[in-house]
Interface confidence: low
C-alpha cells in the first residue's frame, strides 16, 4: 500500500506543476521515528488543503485515493500512542513542492520499517 501512496504523491506533484497554488502547508521535514504516525496524520490533513485549493477533479480523486490507502496502511500500526510529538500547527509552513517531497520521505520511512 505504501508503494501506491508514493505513486499517488508523485502524480499529485505532476498535476500541480501546471497550476499556481500559493498555499503553504504545515510540513514535518525532520520526522523522528517515534513520531512518524503523528507526522503522517498531519501530512494527510494538510493534503486536503491541496485538494480544496486546486479545485481540480483529478487532484481531488488522487488525494482521496491516497488518504484511503495511507489510512489502511496506518491501521497496521494499531492504536499507536506517541507522546512528545509536535502538533500539526507547530510545524513549519512550506510550499507545496517541499511539502510533497517531505511527504515522500516519510512514506519511505514507513516502507523501510514495514
Amino acid at each position: 500500500n505504501w508503494v501506491n501512496v508514493i505513486s499517488d504523491l508523485k502524480k499529485i506533484e505532476d498535476l500541480i506543476q501546471s497550476m499556481h497554488i500559493d498555499a503553504t502547508l504545515y510540513t514535518e521535514s525532520d520526522v523522528h521515528p517515534s513520531c512518524k504516525v503523528t507526522a503522517m496524520k498531519c501530512f494527510l490533513l494538510e493534503l486536503q488543503v491541496i485538494s480544496l485549493e486546486s479545485g481540480d477533479a483529478s487532484i481531488h480523486d488522487t488525494v482521496e485515493n491516497l488518504i484511503i490507502l495511507a489510512n489502511n496502511s496506518l491501521s497496521s500500526n494499531g492504536n499507536v500512542t506517541e507522546s512528545g510529538c509536535k502538533e500539526c500547527e507547530e510545524l513549519e509552513e512550506k510550499n507545496i513542492k517541499e511539502f510533497l517531497q517531505s511527504f515522500v520521505h516519510i512514506v519511505q520511512m514507513f516502507i523501510n520499517t514495514s
Epitope: E13, H105, Q108
Partner: antibody
C-alpha cells in the same frame, strides 16, 4: 537480496556517445531514488545527479547539468547514465546507488569503468 | 551548494587505536542528514552512518557518528585491520548531495 548490477567497462574515443546501465533487483524500483556518482582516477566521490524512476523526476549537480543525461526504464528496472559526446576528462569509474534512508546511498553498484582515449 | 570539508586528510594509526574523523559543512545541514561511507581500494563505497548518528544495516558498532548543524564526527572506537580505508562524508537531504574530499585512515 537488493542488488544494483552495472554494465561492463567501456573504452571509447573522444566525441563518441555512450550509455551505461544499472539494473536493479530485490525491491520496488519505482519507490527509491537512484543516484550516479563519479570517481576520477585516484580522486574522491562526486555526486552527479539522481532520478526518481516512478516518474523520471531528475535532479543534477550544477557541475554535471548539461554534460550527462540520467534516465530510467521502469519496465526493466534499469537506470541509465549517458553522454552524447565524450571527452578524455570523462575517464572515471561511475557508480549507481540507491537513495535509501532520506536518500543516503545505502546500496551501490559495482561500478563501470569508462576510459576515453584517442 | 553545501561544501563539506574533511579533516585530517590522512590519519596514521595502529590497529586497536581510536580514530576520530571530522566533517565540517559550509552551512547548516538540514535535519542533520549527514552520511559516512567507507571505501577500500578497488571496491564501491559502503554506507556506514546516515542521519549523522544512525548505524547502517550490517555495520559493526565500533563505528559511531555524532554532530549537528555544521560539525560532524565519525569515530571508530578500536581500529580493526579491515578498517584501514578512505572515509567520505555526504549531506543527503538537499540536491546536490555533496561529498567531502575524503580522509584516508592508514596503518602507522
Amino acid at each position: 537480496e537488493v542488488q544494483l548490477v552495472q554494465s561492463g567497462a567501456e573504452v571509447k574515443k573522444p566525441g563518441e556517445s555512450l550509455k551505461i546501465s544499472c539494473k536493479v533487483s530485490g525491491y520496488f524500483f519505482t519507490t527509491y531514488w537512484i543516484g550516479w556518482v563519479r570517481q576520477m582516477p585516484g580522486k574522491g566521490l562526486e555526486y552527479m545527479g539522481i532520478i526518481y524512476p516512478g516518474d523520471s523526476d531528475t535532479r543534477y549537480s550544477p557541475s554535471f547539468q548539461g554534460q550527462v543525461t540520467i534516465s530510467a526504464d521502469k519496465s526493466i528496472s534499469t537506470a541509465y547514465l549517458q553522454w552524447s559526446s565524450l571527452k578524455a576528462s570523462d575517464t572515471a569509474m561511475y557508480y549507481c546507488a540507491r537513495g535509501g534512508h532520506w536518500n543516503a546511498f545505502d546500496i551501490w553498484g559495482q561500478g563501470t569503468l569508462v576510459t576515453v582515449s584517442s | 551548494e553545501i561544501v563539506l570539508t574533511q579533516s585530517p586528510g590522512t590519519l596514521s594509526l595502529s590497529p586497536g587505536e581510536r580514530a576520530t574523523l571530522s566533517c565540517r559543512a559550509s552551512q547548516s545541514v538540514i535535519g542533520s542528514y549527514l552520511a559516512w561511507y567507507q571505501q577500500k581500494p578497488g571496491q564501491a563505497p559502503r554506507l556506514l552512518i546516515y542521519s549523522a548518528s544512525k548505524l547502517a544495516s550490517g555495520i559493526p558498532d565500533r563505528f559511531s557518528g555524532s554532530g549537528s548543524g555544521t560539525d560532524f564526527t565519525l569515530t571508530i572506537s578500536r581500529l580493526e585491520p579491515e578498517d584501514f580505508a578512505v572515509y567520505y562524508c555526504q549531506q543527503h537531504y538537499s540536491t546536490p548531495g555533496t561529498f567531502g574530499q575524503g580522509t584516508k585512515v592508514e596503518i602507522k
